[in-house]
């Protein structure tokens, strides 16, 4: 005759408060004759959870019809789960005896634990912007999950990062846990449009991880390059000088013109354009009056970007006698 096996397939069952838990138990033989009972815990203090023959178990129902002659499925459902229901559940076969049934074999047990989903990961970047080629730190936090086992990954534009440190607290037993991870990211000049992603995988999420994102645009400062040029064309007695401020981020920019060290207050024409990589270009035109009595003029384009120290470029204006005499356009 085949030896009876008590099969409880799940070692761990995660449930959420208020839901129904299904505890599986099947037997491999109908012999010996006798009932199958469910208990929580072991030892003299173990608690009877279900006995088909006697007792009142309002929250427990059976998955199969236990009165059927050849039934081998003794799985049960426990409704309205509360934190008090956690523990290890055993299905136990008893052999019919007199005056009392005698315990024959126990299943290996299924641990019922409260599963709690992690909160949506929150990613925080550095407090101040940093320039390319430097390293910045991002933190990712998620709270309230259980059990403690959790996986956290970092990505930059879809590429997995390896330079990060993760802690799960508390270290001991707890109702819920928190995870905090800090990733170190080297900024590239084109990172204005980049994203870092913190991805959290947990057993309660059924393979659908949670993600938190941060835009590197919040962390990066791309300083501008400046170029001041004198236009070859002239209109009447005015020369057009251009200051090109290229590839900067963020947009915050102050530009001032100085003529021989004196700040010019008059209006100048300018345009702002956005590059494909998210950086900006700013072009400012400055018209200088040319007259016979003028000495050489030194023009300065000064740019203050995102509250940083001002940078400037100078241009010594080249005005020839020919230019002074002629109204026609000429190349200096």
């Amino acid at each position: 005759e085949e030896e009876l096996q008590m099969i409880q397939p799940e070692k761990l069952l995660l449930v959420t408060v208020g839901k129904t838990a299904t505890l599986h138990c099947t037997v491999t033989s109908l012999l010996p004759v006798g009932p199958v009972l469910w208990f929580r815990g072991v030892g003299p203090g173990r608690e009877l959870i279900y006995n088909q023959k006697e007792g009142h178990f309002p929250r427990v129902t059976t998955v199969s019809d236990l009165t059927k002659r050849n039934n081998m499925d003794f799985s049960i459902r426990i409704s309205s789960i509360t934190p008090a229901d956690v523990g290890t559940y055993y299905c136990v076969k008893f052999r019919k005896g007199s005056p009392e049934n005698v315990e024959f074999k126990s299943g290996p047990g299924t641990e019922m634990a409260l599963g709690a989903k992690p909160s949506a990961p929150v990613v925080l970047g550095p407090a101040a912007r940093t320039t390319p080629e430097h390293t910045v730190s991002f933190t990712c936090e998620s709270h309230g999950f259980s059990p403690r086992d959790i996986t956290l990954k970092w990505f930059k534009n879809g590429n997995e990062l390896s330079d990060f440190q993760t802690n799960v607290d508390p270290t001991g037993q707890s109702v819920a846990y928190s995870i905090r991870s800090t990733a170190r990211v080297v900024l590239d000049p084109w990172d204005v449009r980049s994203q870092v992603i913190c991805e959290v995988a947990h057993v309660t999420l059924q393979g659908d991880p949670l993600r938190g994102t941060a835009n590197l645009s919040e962390a990066i400062r791309v300083p501008p390059t400046l170029e001041v040029t004198q236009q070859p064309m002239r209109v009447g007695n005015q020369v057009n000088v251009t200051c090109q401020v290229r590839k900067f981020y963020p947009q915050s920019l102050q530009l001032t013109w100085s003529e021989n060290g004196n700040v010019c207050q008059r209006e100048t024409a300018s345009t702002l354009t956005e590059n494909k990589d998210g950086t900006y270009n700013w072009t400012s035109w400055f018209l200088v009056n040319i007259s016979d009595q003028r000495d050489d003029v030194v023009l300065t384009c000064q740019v203050k970007h995102d509250g940083q120290l001002a940078v400037s470029k100078r241009l010594a204006l080249e005005v020839t006698v020919h230019q002074k005499d002629q109204s026609s356009d000429a190349t200096p």
Epitope: V42, G45, R46, V102
Partner: antibody, heavy 122, light 107 residues
Framework: EVQLVQSGAEVVKPGASVKLSCKAS????????MHWVKQAPGQGLEWIGA????????TYNQKFKGKATLTVDKSASTAYMELSSLRSEDTAVYYC???????????????WGQGTLVTVSS | DIQMTQSPSSLSASVGDRVTITCRAS??????LNWLQQKPGKAPKRLIY???SLDSGVPSRFSGSGSGTEFTLTISSLQPEDFATYYC?????????FGGGTKVEIK
């Protein structure tokens, strides 16, 4: 009628061992956990541990681990407790009592043996 | 381990007196508490199980109440045969623990 009958009084020398017995009658021996309780002269009660005859599963009070060893003989419906390396502080009355195979409130410690006095003396 | 603190450790009373003994558990044990009576040279005898359920043959002058961590045994009218030592016992969690006992003596 359920009865738990314990072996007679023992006088033993320090360092020796002694094995006490508790024979159950009147119900299915294997359906119950057999517990052992110590009561030193003029003192209160202390739970030592328990054994489940079905599979000889044991549970001990940490304080008595290494001091007490619980065994059963199912065929004789008898539980045993061996006390080792005896010292004067082990002088006490030792009781057996029982509880049901799960924690049915009505079946905890309702039946008790009459007790066995163990005197440790040189 | 769960500690059971019983008070008083002894009391003197007269026949007909109302006697109250309390037991405090160091953590919640629900209602899993027994009250035992022990007379000199005899094995303990259970009077009450599950905090308030009277064992068969136990006089109705004995009653138990409480839950969680605070429990009380009351003898409504003390009789000569009630002079004994009383113990509370928790069976909620292993190791199972007893109170220190209350000796009820004749005044």
């Amino acid at each position: 009628e359920v009865q738990l009958v314990q072996s007679g009084a023992e006088v033993v020398k320090p360092g020796a061992s002694v094995k006490l017995s508790c024979k159950a009658s009147g119900s299915t021996f294997t359906s119950y956990w057999m517990h052992w309780v110590k009561q030193a002269p003029g003192q209160g009660l202390e739970w030592i541990g328990a054994i489940y005859p079905v599979n000889s599963d044991t549970t001990y009070n940490q304080k008595f681990k290494g001091k007490a060893t619980l065994t059963v003989d199912k065929s004789a419906s008898t539980a045993y407790m061996e006390l080792s390396s005896l010292r004067s502080e082990d002088t006490a009355v030792y009781y057996c009592t029982r509880s049901f195979y799960y924690s049915l409130d009505a079946a905890w410690f309702v039946y008790w043996g009459q007790g066995t006095l163990v005197t440790v003396s040189s | 381990d769960i500690q059971m603190t019983q008070s008083p450790s002894s009391l003197s009373a007269s026949v007909g007196d109302r006697v109250t003994i309390t037991c405090r558990a160091s953590q919640d044990i629900g209602s899993r508490l027994n009250w035992l009576q022990q007379k000199p040279g005899k094995a303990p005898k259970r009077l009450i199980y599950a905090t308030s359920s009277l064992d068969s043959g136990v006089p109705s002058r004995f009653s138990g109440s409480g839950s969680g961590t605070e429990f009380t045994l009351t003898i409504s009218s003390l009789q000569p045969e009630d002079f004994a030592t009383y113990y509370c016992l928790q069976y909620a969690s292993s190791p199972f623990t007893f109170g220190g006992g209350t000796k009820v003596e004749i005044k």
